[in-house]
Structures are given as C-alpha cells and as structure tokens.
C-alpha cells in the first residue's frame, strides 16, 4: 500500500466521573493482544452513547490511553489493563494521546505503530512566513523614525 499518513500527536488529561451508564467505553490492546503492530498500548475502540466519556466529549475512538489515575498502562496484559479501569473508582483521571491525521500523500509508507510527527515543511513554512512579516514590520517601523 502506497501513501503516507502523518499525525499531529497531542496529549490531554481527561477527568471522568463514572455515571449511571459507567465510563462508557471499550478498549483493545495490551502485551498479549497488540492492536497496533510493535505497540502494546491500550487504545479506545468504542465509545458508548450516554456513558461518561460520550457526555464529556473529549475522548475519541482511536485514542491511546497512557495512564489511569496516574498509573502507567505500559507493558500490561489486556486483562490487567481492564482490571485497572474497573477498580479505578468513581472519579477517573485519564492521560490520553490523541492522534490527528494531518496529511495524506503518495510518499512512501509509515507503519501503523509509528506515531510519526507533523511534516517538517508544515512547521517551517509558518515560521518563515512569521519571520518575513516581522522583518517587514521592522523595516516599516524604521522608515517612520
């Protein structure tokens, strides 16, 4: 398969309260059942209607959950991760990694497990434009003196 997928990766702390419909989401992944190749992380696979996650609105399907109430989810068996959530109590703090797809192009291919960053030109172009605007403003300011 040709084509390149690039991602803007952001992290967020999401605090949820287990409501009458629970936290209301499902997970996949773990060291014994990898969801992404070369990545044993825990991912959100489904968000249920009327659950705390759906009502809050920030957690998205495909998000990677890094920690629960400060406890790291790295290198956990799937069932151990499930148990961690189920025993997390009423108030649950999630550290979450969102991956926003920012570009598709026919340049090579990155593996699913590579949380590759934003393309360099997408950083350089705005920086260059900002520099040019600042230089132009500076020159006009000098001319007025």
């Amino acid at each position: 398969m040709n084509g390149r997928v690039d991602y803007l990766v952001t992290e967020e702390e999401i605090n949820l309260t287990r409501g009458p419909s629970g936290l209301g989401f499902n997970i996949v992944g773990g060291t014994d059942q990898q969801y992404v190749s070369n990545d044993s992380g825990i991912y959100v696979s489904r968000i249920k209607e009327n659950g705390a996650a759906a009502l809050d609105g920030r957690l998205q399907e495909g998000d990677k959950i890094l920690s629960v109430n400060g406890q790291d989810l790295k290198n956990l068996l799937h069932q151990d991760a499930v148990d961690l959530f189920r025993n997390a109590g009423y108030a649950v703090s999630l550290r979450v990694q969102h991956r926003l797809q920012v570009q598709n192009g026919p340049i090579g291919h990155r593996g699913e497990g590579d949380p590759s960053g934003i393309p360099i030109f997408m950083v350089l172009v705005p920086v260059f434009a900002l520099t040019m605007v600042a230089a132009w403003a500076f020159m006009r300011y000098r001319q007025q003196l």
């Epitope: 287990r18 629970g22 996949v28 696979s45 659950g51 799937h78 959530f85 189920r86």
Partner: nanobody, 127 residues
Framework: EVQLVESGGGLVQAGGSLRLSCAAS????????MAWFRQSPGKERELVAD????????YYRDSVKGRFTISRDNAKNTVYLQMNGLKPEDTAVYYC?????????????????????WGQGTQVTVS
C-alpha cells in the same frame, strides 16, 4: 464471514445437567472474549457468563455462580457452558457471543452492545 453455532440444548429435569457448545468459524484472532447470554420470553437478553480469549479470566452472573462453568478450547475455536443443578428459571434460549474489545466498566454495566458476533441460539428447557 464469522459464524457462531450453538449446540447441546434440550429438555432436562430440574437438578439435571446440560453442556452447551459454541463453535466459531472465520477469523477470530482479534477476539477478546466469548460469552453466553440467555433470553426467556418477555425478558431482555442477559449475560450469563464470559471468558476472556487469552487470559482465562471468567465472569458469572450471581444466579448461576457455583452451578455453571464457562470454558474455552482455543485450538478448536470452541466455547462451552457446563450447566449443573438446573432450575426451571434457567429455561431460556441460550446465545453464544464474541467480543472484539473489553468494556472498562464493571460487569453490571456490560450488555448486548459490548458483543460483536452472535449465534442463532439453542433452547434450554428445565421442567
């Protein structure tokens, strides 16, 4: 195409035993667990027992604890429900189900919507 086929249902006297089987065909590599649900006339389908596909973790609803045993044979892609000490209130159509993820909520929140594949059901009648 994933298919779940149940067998082993039937008519049994109170106190008797039955063993239900559920044979899965098709790709099951991404399954996280399998379960048995039951539904009696006029009632909602309810989760009876669940077994994780890899870890051997099991769940039983309170009313069947100590009487029913869920087990799986990964090599045969088959899940079993051994039902002992059957009671008239166990009468229902029993459905096999498979899930491709796990709910993060306790079992009392888990229901039909957490399972992705279903069998056609097998009737269990306890007289």
């Amino acid at each position: 195409e994933v298919q779940l086929v149940e067998s082993g249902g039937g008519l049994v006297q109170a106190g008797g035993s039955l063993r239900l089987s559920c044979a899965a065909s098709g790709p099951s590599m991404n399954w996280y667990g399998m379960a048995w649900f039951r539904q009696s006339p006029g009632k909602e389908r309810e989760l009876v027992a669940d077994v994780s596909w890899s870890g051997g973790s099991t769940y039983y609803r309170d009313s069947v604890k100590g009487r029913f045993t869920i087990s799986r044979d990964n090599a045969k892609n088959t899940v079993y429900l051994q039902m002992n000490g059957l009671k008239p209130e166990d009468t229902a159509v029993y459905y096999c189900a498979a899930r491709t993820s796990s709910s993060v909520d306790p079992w009392n929140y888990v229901g039909v919507g957490d399972y992705d594949y279903w069998g056609q059901g097998t009737q269990v009648t306890v007289s």
